[in-house]
């Protein structure tokens, strides 16, 4: 007789698929039309685009109105005219729920000024944002953001109660906190009071870009997390670029998108944008490269091969392996919902499988170092419900040149430097 | 450096066209809308509208619907403005504009910043 | 459309004295899209400050702007014989985008 399937669990729309943050929405629409047209509006024309990515929910702003570092002059119920009007984004909303995409808010109250927060007024910012979450859940909101909460005194009793006013209104809204800090012990102060908060923090940052280091991050918060939902990203708020090398970046999307939780990207991560290379962007938001003319000060500053519009016609570029990786989450159980294990597979490699009952189980390998290594794959770490098998097929790899669909030999597996591989193989009895 | 030449002056007669050019260099020419301004002897400014050089798209004031085209040709980075059955009181010098991204407190800014030096356009009989 | 009035039409000053010109537009305009010119006669207009209050390049530190809402204010701490010139009050945050009609700053 065939064993019983396992149970789905219960899943919402953020276990779906990727998080995508415009912090900027000026920057993401591009310059070149000035204030012409709202942000917001702007941002409905690019619609298409994000539907494109398959990520599941638009992190927006904050769009409200700031004076910098005046608590008077900050209403959170406002958006600011430099993005827009209430008009403008309740057609955005509508839009968005037309095309399956969640809007979550950034309500981080000074994002202009000094301390996010304003320090000395803790109570009377705490308020607002009450007030604010009621409103913009009535106005249609999927959910909302906090920046910066390790500035916010009291940070777990507050996120608790935003929580109850978030999930009181539907179970199905979601309450995201960002905090610059890398530290795990501070990370899980913040999450053991709030068990359904999303927290997206520095803690991958300093991964110091080896395999082995990478690895017991990942498994060390996993553990740390029990089996509670988390989300992965490289920060709060900044770029990947900001972060890691070019050629990292095709291993860190690989990954981000096949561990056991929510990928969160910003705006260009996708293409690799990177604010170092315009020269005169500013570091925290520069202008999005739509095409070769979205960055026209500098002729020449911007290849095709740097922008969306090239790379969109290039199957190999990391527009279109971002793609790839996010329509493979997005659909495959084993990578939606499925159990989690590393194991060793030899210095400066990171590996683990995810599988879900009977479905397609996945194998990824990833090498951090900057040699090409023979991957050792221990599978006596593996429990038997994840056991190996002597071959995988190669979804894909992030480098060019290896055979798709090609059936692999685990046992001689080798990797390029940098290079992450997919493989997929069938559940066996 | 960002440069916007523009076509030399003209005299027409009542109920002619003009068509002024701009030709722009020092930057990505699709980059960029390029506005049309005009300014009325010992008057102020008046703001006519602007063409997206990358779409081709328009935006014309009201005021001068139906009588102004605003064209480009992006193989030789040049905008024009056409003004068609031309009044005494279209006399004034025109101007082509662009803006300039500026970052400042948090938020992007998008004055016009760079300018044509102007065409004196005279209509006369 | 916004209306934008400016005050006075004429400034008759001394080089070395403070210049304060006033732009009053009817109805509230985003402070981030107010800029003010300077056209000396013959030259094209030259941006002196955009967002109200934010110098533009190349702008010397005696000219500030300050205002917000429907008051705006332009002001040279201490005029320099190059400032002797007519300046423009702009707002770029609606469409159509409008000036003001000038304030001439000439020679006492």
């Known amino acids: 007789r065939a064993p019983r399937c396992r149970e789905l669990p219960a899943q919402k729309w953020w276990h779906t698929g990727a998080l995508y943050r415009i912090g900027d929405l000026q920057a993401f629409q591009g310059h070149g039309a000035g204030n012409l047209a709202a942000p917001i509006s702007g941002l409905k024309g690019r619609l298409d685009y994000l539907s494109s990515l398959k990520v599941k929910g638009l992190v927006l702003g904050p769009i409200h109105k700031n004076q910098k570092d005046d608590v008077a002059q900050t209403d959170l119920l406002q958006i600011d005219p430099n993005f827009g009007s209430k008009e403008d984004f309740d057609s955005l909303l509508q839009s968005a729920k037309k095309k399956s995409i969640r809007v979550i808010l950034d309500l981080t109250p000074n994002y202009r000024g000094e301390n996010s927060w304003f320090s000395t007024q803790v109570d009377t910012v705490a308020t607002k944002v009450k007030d604010a979450l009621e409103f913009w859940l009535q106005a249609g909101v999927d959910g909302f953001q906090v920046r910066d909460i390790e500035n916010l005194k009291d940070a777990s009793s507050f996120l608790a109660e935003w929580q109850n006013i978030t999930k009181g209104f539907s179970e199905d809204r979601l309450l995201i906190a960002g905090t610059n800090s890398s530290d795990l012990q501070q990370i899980l102060s913040l999450l053991e009071s709030n068990k359904d908060l999303l927290l997206t923090s520095s803690y991958l940052s300093d991964s110091g870009s080896t395999g082995e280091h990478t690895k017991s991050l990942v498994t060390q918060y996993l553990n740390a997390t029990g089996n509670r939902w988390c989300s992965w990203s490289l920060s709060q708020a900044r770029l990947l670029t900001s972060f890691l090398p070019a050629q990292l970046l095709r291993l860190y999307q690989l990954m981000l998108f096949t561990l056991p939780g929510t990928p969160v990207f910003s705006y260009g991560d996708e293409i690799g944008l990177d604010a170092a290379a315009l020269p005169g962007q500013p570091m925290e938001a520069p202008v999005m490269l739509w095409d070769e003319s979205s960055f026209p000060d500098i002729p020449g500053a911007v290849s095709a091969n740097m922008t969306v519009k090239g790379q969109s016609e290039d199957p190999g570029s990391l527009l279109s392996l971002f793609r790839r990786l996010s329509d493979q989450r997005s659909k495959e159980r084993s990578l939606l919902h499925g159990d989690f294990h590393a194991f060793s597979a030899g210095p400066g490699l990171f590996s683990y499988i995810r599988h879900w009952d009977q479905n397609e189980r996945f194998l990824v390998v990833l090498n951090f170092g900057d040699v090409g290594l023979s991957a050792g794959l221990q599978a006596s770490d593996l429990p038997a419900s994840a056991s190996l098998p002597a071959k995988a097929d190669l979804l894909l790899s992030t480098q060019p040149g290896r055979e798709e669909g090609s059936p692999l030999e685990l046992e001689r597996l080798k990797l390029e430097p940098h290079e992450g591989l997919l493989l997929r193989f069938p559940y066996a009895a | 450096q960002v440069q916007l030449v523009q076509s030399g002056a003209e005299v027409k007669r009542p109920g002619a066209s003009v068509k002024v050019s701009c030709k722009a260099s020092?930057?990505?020419?699709?980059?960029?809308?390029i506005h049309w301004l005009r300014q009325a002897p010992g008057q102020g400014l008046e703001w006519m509208g602007w063409?997206?050089?990358?779409?081709?798209?328009?935006n014309y004031i009201q005021k001068f619907q139906g009588r102004v085209t605003m064209t480009r040709d992006t193989s030789i980075s040049t905008a024009y403005m056409d003004l068609s059955r031309l009044r005494s009181d279209d006399t004034a010098v025109f101007y082509c504009?662009?803006?300039?991204?500026?970052?400042?407190?948090?938020?992007?800014?998008?004055?016009?910043?760079?300018w044509g030096q102007g065409t004196l356009v005279t209509v006369s009989s | 459309e916004i209306v934008l009035t400016q005050s006075p039409g004429t400034l008759s000053l001394s080089p070395g004295e403070r210049a304060t010109l006033s732009c009053r537009a009817s109805q509230s305009v985003s402070s981030s899209y107010l800029a003010w010119y300077q056209q000396k006669p013959g030259q094209a207009p030259r941006l002196l400050i955009y967002?109200?209050?934010s110098r533009a390049t190349g702008i010397p530190d005696r000219f500030s702007g300050s205002g917000s809402g429907t008051d705006f204010t332009l002001t040279i701490s201490r005029l320099e014989p190059e400032d002797f010139a007519v300046y423009y009050c702009q707002q770029y945050g609606s469409s159509p985008w409008t000036f003001g009609q000038g304030t001439k700053v000439e020679i006492k």
């Open positions: 020092g930057y990505i020419f699709t980059g960029y809308y």
């Open positions: 504009a662009r803006i300039q991204v500026y970052y400042d407190g948090g938020i992007y800014n998008y004055p016009l910043h760079h």
């Open positions: 967002g109200a209050s």
């Open positions: 063409i997206n050089p990358n779409s081709g798209d328009t």
